[in-house]
Amino acid sequence: LEVSESPGSIQVARGQPAVLPCTFTTSAALINLNVIWMVTPLSNANQPEQVILYQGGQMFDGAPRFHGRVGFTGTMPATNVSIFINNTQLSDTGTYQCLVNNLPDIGGRNIGVTGLTVLVPPSAPHCQIQGSQDIGSDVILLCSSEEGIPRPTYLWEKLDNTLKLPPTATQDQVQGTVTIRNISALSSGLYQCVASNAIGTSTCLLDLQVISPQPRNIG
């Protein structure tokens, strides 16, 4: 019995279905086919879980979190024992193993390994201002998404006809911050932060209004 090489790793956007491949060759009839799919979750590497089991001509559910979401892609028994996972969740990220036995065919490689990574677009970022908005002050515009796999980058732009930040601004595209030094009336306006990764973008807006000193009455 010989399980074929798998593609190594599969990536899928959260909520989309994933197909984890596993095929094998055997010299025996598929009467005593036994297939166990296991996962070592990334979030809990020392706690392997059963995903689905085929034994004695019957299918059995694995861990409760997979119930109703997992199945074999084809009619069993077969030499293609690939599975699908519907509505993928972040917690599905991990290393999946298919263990195949088909007595009396023993020997050879009976395990296939495939990594699954569930990707998440950036969640709606939170925009905020740190620091005094008085003229001449330094302010920091902050932007961060709670979710996003792979790690998002953040791009701040001023929503005027140039889309350019003030010349005194420096931005950190990973942290999502923009520092604007010595703010002036020209710094006022609407700023947009765009959080993006390979599978999505999300935005938030922030209105910066620089406060000019009030003229003082003399008398």
Partner: antibody, heavy 121, light 107 residues
Framework: QVQLVQSGAEVKKPGASVKVSCKAS????????ISWVRQAPGQGLEWMGW????????NYAQKLQGRVTMTTDTSTSTAYMELRSLRSDDTAVYYC??????????????WGQGTLVTVSS | DIVMTQSPSTLSASVGDRVTITCRAS??????LAWYQQKPGKAPKLLIY???SLESGVPSRFSGSGSGTEFTLTISSLQPDDFATYYC?????????FGQGTKVEIK
């Protein structure tokens, strides 16, 4: 098994355009972005821009804005970079590179073999 | 654009030597720095990201440190396979920019 295979060398005249392809295999193409990086002979590396293979979003280096277009064809898992109005200083090896699987579009964990584009009259 | 300056431009060393390459940024880039190795006629290979995180499959003799504007790549014991050109790359602000490279050659 991740592989990025680029198209062959090109010789172009000043003012012409070039389109370089980058065929990906061994991973889910639409789950990553592709950056393009070029290297002039004997020089350092220059980032040109990025495209998401998932939704086609792009981010180009300001210096090349208006001359460069990056596209993808998800049916063939191929990324393309077109550079127009070529000048002699565009002579370089052009690389495609995949987003890093953890930190995303900021660094590149797999690279194509490079495509030499020579601009000469 | 953020300018990345590497030093030295060329470094002569012997197998077994401890080698240090420095990269300076023209403004603070937090820890958003990567190091690549490139051999003649080949594509660059990622060694380090986030200033100090070792890329999967890269030998542990490579290490990175630093934050803000000053960063170092250290090869604890230079091996024959390590003779190459090394580049730093910042990803704090677009456009991502690279250093001019440091060539490590055999003494």
């Amino acid at each position: 098994q991740v592989q990025l295979v680029q198209s062959g060398a090109e010789v172009k005249k000043p003012g012409a355009s070039v389109k370089v392809s980058c065929k990906a295999s061994g991973y889910t193409f639409t789950s990553y972005g592709i950056s393009w990086v070029r290297q002039a002979p004997g020089q350092g590396l220059e980032w040109m821009g990025w495209i998401s293979a998932y939704n086609g979003n792009t981010n180009y280096a300001q210096k090349l804005q208006g001359r460069v277009t990056m596209t993808t064809d998800t049916s063939t898992s191929t990324a393309y970079m077109e550079l127009r109005s070529l000048r002699s200083d565009d002579t370089a090896v052009y690389y495609c590179a995949r987003d890093h699987s953890i930190v995303g579009a900021t660094t590149f964990d797999y690279w194509g073999q490079g495509t030499l584009v020579t601009v000469s009259s | 654009d953020i300018v990345m300056t590497q030093s030295p431009s060329t470094l002569s060393a012997s197998v077994g030597d401890r080698v240090t390459i420095t990269c300076r940024a023209s403004q603070s880039i937090s820890s958003w720095l990567a190091w690549y190795q490139q051999k003649p006629g080949k594509a660059p290979k990622l060694l380090i990201y986030d200033a100090s995180s070792l890329e999967s499959g890269v030998p542990s003799r490579f290490s990175g440190s630093g934050s803000g504007t000053e960063f170092t790549l250290t090869i604890s014991s230079l091996q024959p396979d390590d003779f190459a050109t090394y580049y730093c790359q910042q990803y704090n602000s677009y456009p991502w920019t690279f250093g001019q490279g440091t060539k490590v050659e055999i003494k």
